[in-house]
């Protein structure tokens, strides 16, 4: 029997029932490699509470349709006194990535999953050449899912201070160059997920091979390797490889763009701070609304409830389905059955069944998937109680006054599946807008101006045009809504600019589009503020002008006009200056544009060194000074000692010259023990220091790539700029 979804075959996938602390391993084409579940288990259930394993789906007992996959077992189970077999049922829906299997619910006998994936699409428009699983569960069964970062066309430009090369990457899948309008990517070879552009040439420096890995709490790693045998002439005989480390920010902040932290010998190290690396909780509710602080999610489906005897209708070929969700209005067809979903046979209206009751409902939100489940319907001939699973999709332009209408998509073993496009499923989620601008390879970053939470305060604009009595206060935040504190406490929740006077507060605009580079300055436009008459809404423009070293000055109100519909501010700030690389001496470096100063001398060890262990070697490194550890050379800044025979290599002479670019401090040690290659290249070490306010001194981590590249990454609070 041919595999129904070949794209999903190469991996064992995971799904979690968080409520019951159960981890499922799923292999839809073969068997999972778990001894306790037996040799032919396709779905293995690991109950972490009881520390037991059960096979709940056998690879041999598989049956499939276009959108449903069933795995039966030979294990009996008892449901309503009838004798059944335990089974797993996976409902497939078309998605834009390989996606993730999601646990829906489980009865005594059936374990239900839903999987939104390109593998289930009728057309191949979203299918990748190469794609790997893009999510992981941590030890606490919390999901970290990078699927939202996957680009369906185009790529992310990795931030790097080198003007001559550009590294483009995608997440977990290859770059689709055909559908990308940008000419730079056209030359990228097919299958590449990391494409290096040098002049008019493009090179494949990495393709996805393994899925996402969790290296430690809130830090995920994705590795790409170049599949082709031929070496690239600029890689000094090394095979290119790319490692992307996704870091969950230590507090709720906007994500950054990916940054190149090392690239010696074509071993490209990328760090990406993004909230998608943080775990996502599953939310569940027995009502039709739910909200979650951590996800910044708020959902209310109660407007979908029909009143006055009305109901929705959905066509199921042989049957009609009448639905009334989120309400307790009896569907007359299903008289006295308390049905939320009522199934009526088209050819015989006396054949009526409840396909789920309104007091047996669960609303579930996970990673953008919103599902409403109605249990406890009339029994089928098999003894199973009918149930309905409604998958909601956000559609801001849905008909029927935004409510949309449910569409029947299929049935398996008396479980009825519907999809429903509606504006009420549009989840208020975190912003995906960037707080910066680009102009070719020039980058501008306004994140230093963002105010996130107490004890920080909003920026208040200077307005010299008013007398004290008629004074208006203008509160501004950058790329973020204003903080509701102090005089801005009464400001509308989603206002990014807010005016406050004796009459109250006004929303002067929301952050709904990223900053733009215009005429040498940065323009930030906030729109969709309060109504200002004639069907118009207030709009605010902020022009940010580069002023090196100044992150303290406040914005100034320049004009307001169009009958109170338009406001213009000007802001002279270092945040509007182009990001540039700066060098420093004596273990310090000064970012003259932003006015930040960094001093890493507290990390220098007067005696000894920092030790980093790997399987075969011990590495000793110091910061801005020599390691004083025998058997290392006295002038080496880093040295490598073989555990087997204590053979030692100098990995570079110590120095105290730091370089700084966009939040990243680097220290390079060169001139170490030469390699045994033709050119006898001296060994070198690169240490990249990255900000982590909670890390204190922190410690170096060796980026284990190959035998001759010595990249260390060091998270430390000493790499954090002082908040201005």
């Amino acid at each position: 029997q041919a595999a129904p979804f070949p794209e999903l075959c190469s991996y064992t996938w995971e799904a979690v029932d968080t409520k019951n602390n159960v981890l499922y391993k799923i292999n839809i084409c073969g068997s999972v490699d778990i001894v306790q579940c037996g040799p032919s288990s396709a779905v293995c259930m690991h109950d972490l509470k009881t520390r037991t394993y059960h096979s709940v789906g056998d690879s041999v007992l598989r049956s499939a349709t276009r959108s449903l996959l069933e795995f039966n077992t030979t294990v009996s189970c008892d449901q309503q006194g009838t004798n059944h077999r335990v089974q797993s049922s996976i409902a497939f829906l078309c998605g834009k990535t390989l996606g993730t299997p999601e646990f829906v619910t489980a009865t005594e006998c059936v374990h239900y999953f839903e999987w939104r994936t390109t593998a289930a699409c009728k057309k191949d428009i979203f299918k990748a050449n190469k794609e790997v699983p893009c999510y992981v569960f941590d030890e606490e069964l919390r999901k970290h899912d990078l699927n939202p970062l996957i680009k369906l066309s185009g790529a992310y430009l990795v931030d790097d201070s080198d003007p001559d090369t550009s590294l483009f990457i995608n997440v977990c899948r290859d770059i689709d160059t055909l559908r990308d309008p940008g000419s730079q990517l056209r030359a990228c070879p097919p299958g590449t997920a990391a494409c290096l552009v040098r002049g008019h040439q493009a090179f494949d420096v990495g393709q996805p091979r393994d899925g996402l890995k969790l290296v430690r709490k809130d830090r995920l790693v994705l590795s790409y390797v170049r599949e082709e045998a031929g070496k690239l002439d600029f890689c000094d005989g090394h095979s290119p490889a790319v490692t992307i480390t996704f870091v969950c920010p230590s507090e709720r902040r906007e994500g950054t763009i990916p940054k190149l932290t090392a690239k010696s010998n074509c071993r490209y190290e990328i760090e990406w701070i993004t909230e998608y690396a943080c775990h996502r909780d599953y939310l569940e509710s027995k009502t039709c609304s739910l909200s979650g602080e951590q996800q910044d999610v708020s959902i209310d489906l109660t407007p979908l409830a029909q009143s006055g005897g009305s109901s929705y209708i959905s066509d199921g070929k042989e049957y009609l389905f009448y639905l009334n969700v989120c309400g307790e209005t009896e569907i007359q067809f299903c008289n006295k059955k308390q049905a939320a979903v009522c199934q009526v046979k088209k050819s015989d209206t006396s054949q009526v069944k409840a396909a789920g009751r309104y007091h047996n409902q669960t609303l579930r939100y996970s990673d953008g998937d919103l599902t409403l489940i109605y249990f406890g319907g009339d029994e089928c001939s098999s003894g199973f109680q009918r149930m309905s699973v409604i998958n909601f999709e956000c559609n801001k332009t849905a008909g029927n006054d935004g409510k949309g209408t449910p569409v029947f998509t299929g049935e398996v073993d008396c479980t009825y599946f519907f999809t429903w496009d509606t504006e009420y499923a549009c989840v208020k989620e975190k912003e995906d807008l960037l707080c910066g601008a680009t102009d070719g390879k020039k980058r501008y970053d306004l994140s230093a101006l963002v105010r996130h939470a107490e004890p920080e305060q909003n920026w208040e604009a200077v307005d010299g045009s008013q007398t004290e009595t008629e004074k208006k206060h203008f509160f501004i935040n950058i790329c973020h809504r204003v903080l509701q504190e102090g005089k801005a406490r009464g400001c509308p929740e989603d206002a990014a600019v807010c005016a406050v006077d004796k009459n109250g507060s006004k929303n002067l605009g929301k952050f709904i589009s990223s900053p733009m580079k215009e005429k040498g300055n940065i323009q930030l436009s906030y729109s969709d503020g309060d109504d200002c008459g004639h069907g118009k809404k207030i709009k605010t423009n902020i022009t940010l002008v580069c002023k090196p070293g100044d992150l303290e000055s406040a914005p100034v109100l320049r004009t307001s006009g169009e009958g109170g519909c338009f406001y213009e501010f000007e802001w002279h700030t270092a945040a509007a200056c182009v990001l540039s690389k700066t060098e420093g001496e004596n273990c310090t470096v000064f970012d003259s544009q932003a006015g930040f100063s960094f001093d890493l001398s507290p990390l220098t060890k007067k005696n000894g060194a920092y030790k980093v262990e790997t399987k075969k070697y011990d590495f000793y490194i110091n910061v801005c000074g020599p390691v004083s550890v025998s058997p290392c050379q006295p002038d080496s800044g880093a040295c490598q000692v073989a555990k087997s025979d204590e053979k030692t290599w100098n990995l570079g002479l110590s120095n105290a010259k730091l370089s700084y670019y966009d939040g990243m401090i680097q220290l390079n040690y060169r001139g170490g023990t030469p390699y045994n290659n033709e050119r006898h290249t001296p060994r070198a070490t690169l240490i990249t220091f990255l900000c982590d306010r909670d890390a204190g001194v922190g410690f170096p981590e060796y980026q284990e790539e190959d035998n001759s590249t010595y990249n260390f990454r060091w998270y430390t609070s000493y790499a954090c700029p002082e908040e201005p």
């Epitope: 009305s310 109901s311 007359q332």
Partner: nanobody, 109 residues
Framework: EVQLVESGGGLVQAGGSLRLSCAAS?????MGWYRQAPGKQRELVAI???????IYADSVQGRFTISRDNAKNTVYLQMNSLKPEDTAVYYC??????WGQGTQVTVSS
Amino acid sequence: EVQLVESGGGLVQAGGSLRLSCAASRSISPMGWYRQAPGKQRELVAIMPSSGTPIYADSVQGRFTISRDNAKNTVYLQMNSLKPEDTAVYYCNVGGGYWGQGTQVTVSS
């Protein structure tokens, strides 16, 4: 409760046309038509959801057209190319279970 008033039934020759109408006492969805021929079960003819496309029984597809006037809370069934096997009592149904009293349609050959 919802009051329904049906009209438009009658006797017609095969190949002829009839138009049924059903007025509800208030706004309600969906609105549609079912029928029951002597000795048979009641079956779907056509139904009009509050939004989206109408649903028709295979046997009437292309011959019958359902429409509604929201302002009048009324649903219509335009029946063309009638056949003897369309003979039945036609029932208006609204809201998923409220029934009209039925109107007889007889198609003679």
